[in-house]
Interface confidence: medium
Amino acid sequence: TQNKALPENVKYGIVLDAGSSHTSLYIYKWPAEKENDTGVVHQVEECRVKGPGISKFVQKVNEIGIYLTDCMERAREVIPRSQHQETPVYLGATAGMRLLRMESEELADRVLDVVERSLSNYPFDFQGARIITGQEEGAYGWITINYLLGKFSQKTRWFSIVPYETNNQETFGALDLGGASTQVTFVPQNQTIESPDNALQFRLYGKDYNVYTHSFLCYGKDQALWQKLAKDIQVASNEILRDPCFHPGYKKVVNVSDLYKTPCTKRFEMTLPFQQFEIQGIGNYQQCHQSILELFNTSYCPYSQCAFNGIFLPPLQGDFGAFSAFYFVMKFLNLTSEKVSQEKVTEMMKKFCAQPWEEIKTSYAGVKEKYLSEYCFSGTYILSLLLQGYHFTADSWEHIHFIGKIQGSDAGWTLGYMLNLTNMIPAEQPLSTPLSHSTYV
């Protein structure tokens, strides 16, 4: 007789990443009997919620339920009904909500309250919605990529599962770029972490890790752009801002009230004699780079060495996975290849930024103009942040790997978050190695 497939003994988990610019829902799946193995959890679905980040719903909280409906319904379809009640749902909000909380704790709580009520209406095991710290965001991103790369496994594999994977057990550093914050997390080489706020100790699968992490609030790509505009309009000769970070011929009117809405621009705020100003692109990479560098205060450092704004940063060590917006932007610019040197990236950015806006619109007709217009800034910002902010060099650039997915799972903090909350990363190495995956008898 023919072998029959047994019903799959699997588990599911859902994590919602409530970012500053949008919310994404991730569904993870793993074999129930292998929960403590490294590398067994994988992503089966990503659903991007239509609309902005949840912090933008502060004046219209009644719309949050509808906003989340499509993706939650998608989760209902993907996960078998029999599994619904034991599938945990977690929502983690990041820097967009951190900023809202800085402005008003009450408003942030109101948004989270409505999010929780909306998510409680679904047949899953809702575990809560919270604003995660920048330190958590960095740490969980680091856990995610190293888990997916198999760095926590004690078995040395003879095969490589990703092109840039080395067979040694040296962990990868994690570079995460969002809309409102950016995180850098890695294991420094025999270096004391001089600032306690930046130090994390983990024991994973029987091994100790001393990890450095920092989250730079307001230095995500969107908030960095707001900062740059607020800085530059201070010295503009009138309400026309000739901006090197936008393509020649590009024009956009900005409301001063929008510019000063975010806490990130408070340090540049001043009474301006106009309510609107117009960005006029001039498309000059070098000038754009110079303008961005003014956002990094490198003159103050109370430690042996700093990134910027007086934040301790140990010497860089090993390979780094750069994900989220680091990847999306560089992918769009076709600069994610391992073979592209830092000099080549800079050269390509110079050419790209100098291209006239009308030409760019024609070449990328399918891309939304709002996003398209900001790639020159974002690409230049990434270079500035990595080189001047984090002190990568032309040589160490080749240790940066721009990663979108690893074995089908998105690089980002959500998987690490779920692994931690479901206790799927044991402190000690599991004693026995479970049998193979076979579900046939």
Epitope: S237, E239, I240, F274
Partner: antibody, heavy 119, light 107 residues
């Protein structure tokens, strides 16, 4: 030297239209925002409208919003004020003035052109 | 809208007198304030900008100062050519607003 010369004023009946012009010379017109300011007989100065250097931004006083339109032609170094649905209270001397943020806000003014709205 | 309350509305003074005109802003204008001079049949002339910066070519007897939301134009020694109407103008926000004007007449 900087010169601003207004023209186009005259006597007009209520409800009718008029177009004022302001010819600029002696400076790079396309770099400057421009204003219209008026002064009713025996009264003080009242700001009317503003247009940015590239015509992307326009502001109006509530008293003229929806009736007056400010525009410019940088190739002709000329500023315009199209006034529709004129009322008796629009009777005034209309001045144009230039504006460049910080040092040059309303720093040069024209001599003015008189608009009289009367039946 | 920002209201600019200018006082006095008129004053009589003699040549050589020290004259002070004040404007009070109803909201913060952060020093974005001009002082203008108007004479019959002449173009309006800017005397002071940014509350206290003297326009080039304007005699040094004119000065501007600020104390909180009060802005002051001072003519240290009135000259015959100074008899005119003076206006303050705020340019901190739209709509731009003027004070009601101060007419300086010969005593």
């Amino acid at each position: 030297q900087v010169q601003l010369v207004e023209s186009g004023g005259g006597v007009v009946q209520p409800g009718r239209s008029l177009r004022l012009s302001c010819a600029a010379s002696g400076f790079t017109f396309s770099d400057y925002g421009m204003h219209w300011v008026r002064q009713a007989p025996g009264k003080g100065l009242e700001w009317v409208a503003y247009i940015s250097s590239g015509s992307s931004i326009m502001y109006y006083a509530d008293t003229v919003k929806g009736r007056f339109t400010i525009s410019r032609d940088n190739s002709k170094n000329t500023l315009y004020l199209q006034m529709n649905s004129l009322r008796a209270e629009d009777t005034a001397v209309y001045y144009c003035a230039r504006d460049l943020y910080y040092d040059h806000v309303l720093d040069y003014w024209g001599q003015g052109t008189t608009v009289t709205v009367s039946s | 809208d920002i209201q600019m309350t200018q006082s006095p509305s008129s004053l009589s003074a003699s040549v050589g007198d020290r004259v002070t005109i004040t404007c009070r802003a109803s909201q913060e204008v952060s020093g974005y304030l001009n002082w203008l001079q108007q004479k019959p049949g002449k173009a309006i002339k800017r005397l002071i900008y940014a509350a206290s910066t003297l326009e080039s070519g304007v005699p040094s007897r004119f000065s501007g100062s600020r104390s909180g939301s009060d802005y002051t134009l001072t003519i240290s020694s009135l000259q015959p050519e100074d008899f005119a109407t003076y206006y303050c103008l705020q340019y901190a926000s739209y709509p731009r607003t003027f004070g009601q004007g101060t007419k300086v007449e010969i005593k």
